[in-house]
């Protein structure tokens, strides 16, 4: 006789579309006409989809909208020439959750809003697996944007200034199709934009533990008191962040107690009672506390009878101020070398000129920083071409 397989005694489902599966074995394998599903009210359902595996017939039923009143005992029934078998199982249909209240706006700026999502109380069934805050500009026909939220208090960033937004909360319960309908909508308007950021911002390393930020003098258009807020954070250590308030009449601030050889991101804004607009991020490294590493990937190319091109790369973060190329005819005295000092560390190639034809040169490279010079591990050899072979 046929046998119904892998059917749990109890299934919890969410209101909405439901695709129960009834799986049966036996010989002959049940055909799709021979498998049915009986609802608690006696309605007989036939499979919408069906497939055979080596040992099983798998019937997939489709209920376009299952409701709480469909809760109760359902029966999977298989009736073949070999016999009939039925397996009752309990389905508990849950109501999708929906917040009863609209979210509350606690605070707004020109580009942010602090929201209490007010996810409780809610109508429907829990437990709540996750929550979404949906938002969009009122006058936009674009789709709702959303963020997943874990706390009741959440900050929405990157909003447009002086714009009306609408907000609502969607609750998601466990199980497939557990997304509830969004709750009531709250409207709010972001603040007008504050003062523009300081102009002419320059961030330069001062020492191993300090950076200096400078800007052009600020001439406010109103009588309001103002100050410059400077935020600095470490790229390497995410938790290392500090905000400094600088009187409005100053045009620089020394950022101290920093770590050597570390990259920092700095931005500034001018605040009155309202917060100003942040500047673009500036980045800089504090000065190094060790000698720099050697230039890497040193290559000598385009060799002629009197010239050659040397190229290299350097590592970021070691406050390298210059590159020195030292070359001399091989075998000549040490003091007969020529030093080329390249003070722009962003340059990564240089053409050596005025070389002798058919001559072997020894080439060394160094990087220099505030501590000293790098130590070359080995020299590079360069052999110029004979005069007649030059292109």
């Amino acid at each position: 006789t046929p046998k119904i397989e892998d059917l749990p005694d109890h299934i919890e489902v969410n209101t909405g579309k439901f695709n129960p599966i009834c799986k049966a074995s036996g010989w002959p394998l049940p055909a799709n006409e021979e498998m049915t599903l009986v609802k608690p009210d006696g309605t007989v359902l036939h499979p919408k989809d069906f497939n055979h595996t080596e040992n099983f017939s798998v019937a997939i039923f489709t209920i376009h909208r299952i409701l709480p009143l469909d809760s109760g005992v359902w029966v999977c029934s298989v009736n073949t020439v070999a016999g009939m078998v039925e397996k009752p199982f309990n389905i508990s249909v849950k109501v999708l959750p929906k917040p009863l209240n609209a979210p509350n706006v606690i605070d707004t700026g020109h580009n942010f809003a602090v929201i209490n999502i007010s996810s409780e109380p809610y109508f429907g069934d829990g437990p709540i697996k996750s929550k979404k805050l949906l938002y969009k500009p009122v006058n936009d026909y674009e789709a709702w944007r959303h963020i997943q939220v874990t706390n009741e208090i959440v900050t929405l960033n990157y909003l447009e200034p002086r714009t009306e937004y609408e907000l609502c909360v969607q609750l998601i319960r466990r199980g497939e199709g557990g997304e509830g309908h969004p709750g009531p909508v709250r409207r709010f308007t972001t603040a007008s934009i504050g003062l523009p950021p300081p102009q002419g911002l320059i961030l330069l390393p001062k020492s191993q533990t300090t950076l200096n930020l400078t800007w052009q003098p600020i001439f406010p258009s109103s009588e309001d008191d103002f100050y410059v807020e400077v935020e600095r954070r470490s790229v390497q250590i995410k938790s290392d962040q500090q905000n400094i308030k600088v009187p409005g009449n100053l045009t620089s601030v020394l950022l101290n107690n920093l770590h050597p050889r570390e990259q920092y991101v700095v931005r500034a804004r001018v605040n009155t009672k309202a917060q100003g607009e942040w500047s673009e991020d500036l980045t800089a490294w504090t000065l190094s506390d060790i000698v720099p590493p050697q230039p890497e990937n040193i290559k000598i190319s385009n060799i002629t009878d009197s010239s050659a091109v040397i190229s290299w790369t350097i590592l970021d973060g070691y406050s390298i101020s210059s590159i020195i190329i030292r070359y001399k005819v091989q075998g000549k005295n040490e003091d007969q070398h020529i030093d080329v000092k390249i003070k722009n560390a962003t340059i990564t190639q240089y053409q050596l000129k005025g070389l002798e034809p058919e001559t072997a040169y020894q080439v060394d490279m160094f990087a220099e920083n505030n501590i000293g010079s790098s130590n070359p591990a080995f020299s590079h050899e360069l052999m110029t071409l004979p005069e007649s072979q030059a292109p």
């Epitope: 002959p28 394998l29 055909a31 799709n32 006409e33 007989v44 359902l45 036939h46 499979p47 919408k48 989809d49 069906f50 497939n51 055979h52 595996t53 080596e54 017939s57 489709t62 376009h64």
Partner: antibody
Framework: EVQLVQSGAEVKKPGASVKVSCKAS????????MNWVRQAPGQGLEWMGM????????RLNQKFMDRVTMTRDTSTSTVYMELSSLRSEDTAVYYC????????WGQGTLVTVSS | DIQMTQSPSSLSASVGDRVTITCRAS??????LNWYQQEPGKAIKRLIY???SLDSGVPKRFSGSRSGTEYTLTISSLESEDFADYYC?????????FGGGTKLEIK
């Protein structure tokens, strides 16, 4: 007893459309898929697609996607298959067949496409 | 699309003979294969579903089997009403595809 009664033979000109019907009885009409299969003269069978009368969901053979429309009328337990932009190679007997894998078949409708 | 190659395309046999018709699938279709009979002037009839399960009302002389991607319909002892066209159908993946058919004629 399951019965599928199809509409009568049709003669159509190239470029025209034809609509074949299949009236079902003897079972719960909205519970089973209805397939459409055709057979050109002296040729084998070719599956065109199917429709589920409960919600009109259709699953079509890609080959016919642009030219076939399957519909149903639950009040009369009838399924329709319309084939447009007819060409001579569409001359065939068109069958409806009940169930996902065709356990009951109609008697067939001959459609002749000729100028 | 999955191709179903059916052989032979025609077959002459006598009442009482044992006959086999085969279908080879171009790729794995598991047991998702049916066999159909088409008699002139009659509705097409499903004989076997899921490779080897006999439809109700179909005589036991019909049987189906499988070896890898080769599927066989066997009629153990031909009767006069068995002379007809036979088709296999794979339903493992859409579009469903039929074999080219086998015409079983009286010798």
């Amino acid at each position: 007893e399951v019965q599928l009664v199809q509409s009568g033979a049709e003669v159509k000109k190239p470029g025209a459309s034809v609509k074949v019907s299949c009236k079902a009885s003897g079972y719960s009409f909205t519970s089973y898929w209805m397939n459409w299969v055709r057979q050109a003269p002296g040729q084998g069978l070719e599956w065109m697609g199917m429709i589920h009368p409960s919600d009109s969901e259709t699953r079509l053979n890609q080959k016919f996607m642009d030219r076939v429309t399957m519909t149903r009328d639950t009040s009369t337990s009838t399924v329709y298959m319309e084939l447009s932009s007819l060409r001579s190679e569409d001359t065939a007997v068109y069958y409806c067949a009940r169930g996902l894998y065709g356990n009951s078949w109609g008697q067939g409708t001959l459609v002749t496409v000729s100028s | 699309d999955i191709q179903m190659t059916q052989s032979p395309s025609s077959l002459s046999a006598s009442v009482g003979d044992r006959v086999t018709i085969t279908c080879r699938a171009s790729q794995d279709i598991g047991i998702s294969l049916n066999w159909y009979q088409q008699e002139p002037g009659k509705a097409i009839k499903r004989l076997i579903y899921a490779t080897s399960s006999l439809d109700s009302g179909v005589p036991k002389r019909f049987s189906g089997s499988r070896s890898g991607t080769e599927y066989t319909l066997t009629i153990s002892s031909l009767e006069s009403e068995d002379f007809a066209d036979y088709y296999c159908l794979q339903y493992a993946s859409s579009p469903y595809t039929f074999g080219g058919g086998t015409k079983l004629e009286i010798k």
